[in-house]
């Protein structure tokens, strides 16, 4: 997260760290007791490593009573996701067992009504992604509030030049932005999950390259079918 600040500890009990061989790779969001939603491209970076999900964490390194690492029973990328595009960049991870819920571990309601968030709406994005252009990684969860950007502006040639489909949304990126390592994490508007950080190799913090988020409401049928 660029231009953000440390989150209040455990105030986002839905927040997950998708890890490979014990290292944070991507963000994720607990959407059901046994399911974490993330970004499909995160798996590509995992290679053949052991994928696990950390729940109940604020610090990645320090011991915390609520922290628990779960093995992944099943990884389900969206069937139409492709390595060369950010389309359908969603991944569902089934935990090896139901998560132990509590004040620091709780699923987040996700948007089912397929309607665009009003431009200008302030939404919260959180993650353990890099906090500087130099690539500094934080130990503790960071977050930032970002205004939603209308799709027409996001589709301008100097922005994303027509690449933003109706199944995506954008948020402003003027110094405050999601960045590398935040992919798969949640964009939360009004206490509801609206978007998932896409995992393209986008420049961060440049206002002409807004953050791109996969709209979960557009994938309600797929999410329901996997969770069923």
């Amino acid at each position: 997260i660029l231009g953000g600040r440390e989150a209040e500890a455990h105030a986002r009990p839905y927040m997950a760290s998708v890890q490979v061989n014990g290292e944070h790779l991507c963000g994720g969001v607990l959407v059901a007791e046994q399911w974490v939603l993330s970004a499909a491209h995160c798996l590509e970076d995992a290679a053949d490593g052991k994928v696990q999900v950390l729940l109940g964490a604020h610090s990645l390194s320090q011991p915390e009573p609520s922290k628990r690492l779960y093995d992944v029973l099943r990884a389900v990328p969206h069937p139409d996701s492709r390595p060369d595009t950010i389309d359908h960049d969603l991944l569902l991870l089934q935990l090896s067992e139901k998560a132990t819920l509590g004040p620091a571990v709780r699923p987040l309601p996700w948007q089912r009504v397929d309607r665009d968030v009003e431009p200008g709406t302030l939404c919260d994005v959180a993650g353990w992604g890099i906090v500087s252009h130099a690539g500094r990684r934080p130990d503790r969860l960071q977050h930032v509030l970002l205004p939603v950007l209308d799709r027409a502006t996001c589709n301008r040639r100097t922005h994303h030049d027509g690449a933003i489909t109706q199944r995506m949304m954008c948020a402003e990126s003027n110094r405050r932005d999601s960045c590398k390592g935040d992919s798969g994490g949640p964009l939360v508007c009004g206490g509801v999950l609206e978007g998932v950080v896409t995992s393209g190799s986008r420049v961060c913090g440049n206002r002409k390259k807004p953050g791109i988020y996969t709209r979960v409401a557009s994938y309600a049928a797929w999410i329901d079918s996997v969770l069923a």
Epitope: R156, R157, I164, K208
Partner: antibody, heavy 116, light 112 residues
């Protein structure tokens, strides 16, 4: 399939105004800016301005400020350009184009002829 | 405004020949985001312009690979490796990095 259908040719008198339209189909109208260009006979293209169909926000080429006014009607997925105080210098073909990707999609053009 | 100067004004070619069109901008057209928004359009007689190349060297979908774009800073080139009859028309370069966006004066590709 993306399609931009412009209104037909106009013959107008000097000093009058004209409003030409550009109806979009094949995509969600509010997802892309609409741009307008002018091309005088045998000449190159000039950018007039653009409009964000979400909020009606506009940007104009300084050269066309006071000459052109851009508007949209979201309910009919139509962009409009009004040209006022017309002179023979304004006789040209006017194009609308969708921005994103680049100007990949253009209307067929509207010929405006200013003549007494 | 950024002035886009194209040369030549007219380019007579034989079918199967290579054609090269130059476009020079009056200032650098590298955008503040680091990208260069230099595009090439072909306008056939009585038609609207068609996008060929965007961001200097990227072919738009459906554009044959005989079209290629190159250049940087202020100097850009469009090459057609083997001219076909359907390639005839007026070629325009365009910059979208600075406001207002501007087009070159055009190069007419015609049969020798």
């Amino acid at each position: 399939e993306v399609h931009l259908q412009q209104s037909g040719p106009e013959l107008v008198k000097p000093g009058a105004s004209v409003k030409i339209s550009c109806k979009a189909s094949g995509y969600t109208f509010t997802d892309f800016y609409k741009n307008w260009m002018r091309q005088r006979h045998g000449e190159s293209l000039e950018w007039i301005g653009d409009i964000n169909p979400n909020n009606g926000g506009t940007n104009y080429n300084q050269k066309f400020k006071g000459k052109a006014t851009l508007t949209v009607d979201k309910s009919s997925s139509t962009a409009y350009m009004e040209l006022r105080s017309l002179t023979s210098e304004d006789s040209a073909v006017y194009y609308c184009a969708r921005e994103g990707p680049s100007f990949a999609y253009w209307g067929q053009g509207t010929l405006v002829t200013v003549s007494a | 405004d950024v002035l886009m100067t194209q040369t030549p004004l007219s380019l007579p070619v034989s079918l199967g020949d290579q054609a090269s069109i130059s476009c020079r901008s009056s200032q650098t057209i590298v955008h503040s985001n680091g990208d260069t928004y230099l595009e090439w359009y072909l306008q056939k007689p009585g038609q609207s312009p068609n996008l060929l190349i965007y961001k200097v060297s990227n072919r738009f979908s459906g554009v044959p690979d005989r079209f290629s774009g190159s250049g940087s800073g202020t100097d850009f080139t469009l090459k057609i490796s083997r001219v076909e009859a359907e390639d005839l028309g007026v070629y325009y370069c365009f910059q979208g990095s600075h406001v207002p966006p501007t087009f070159g004066g055009g190069t007419k590709l015609e049969i020798k």
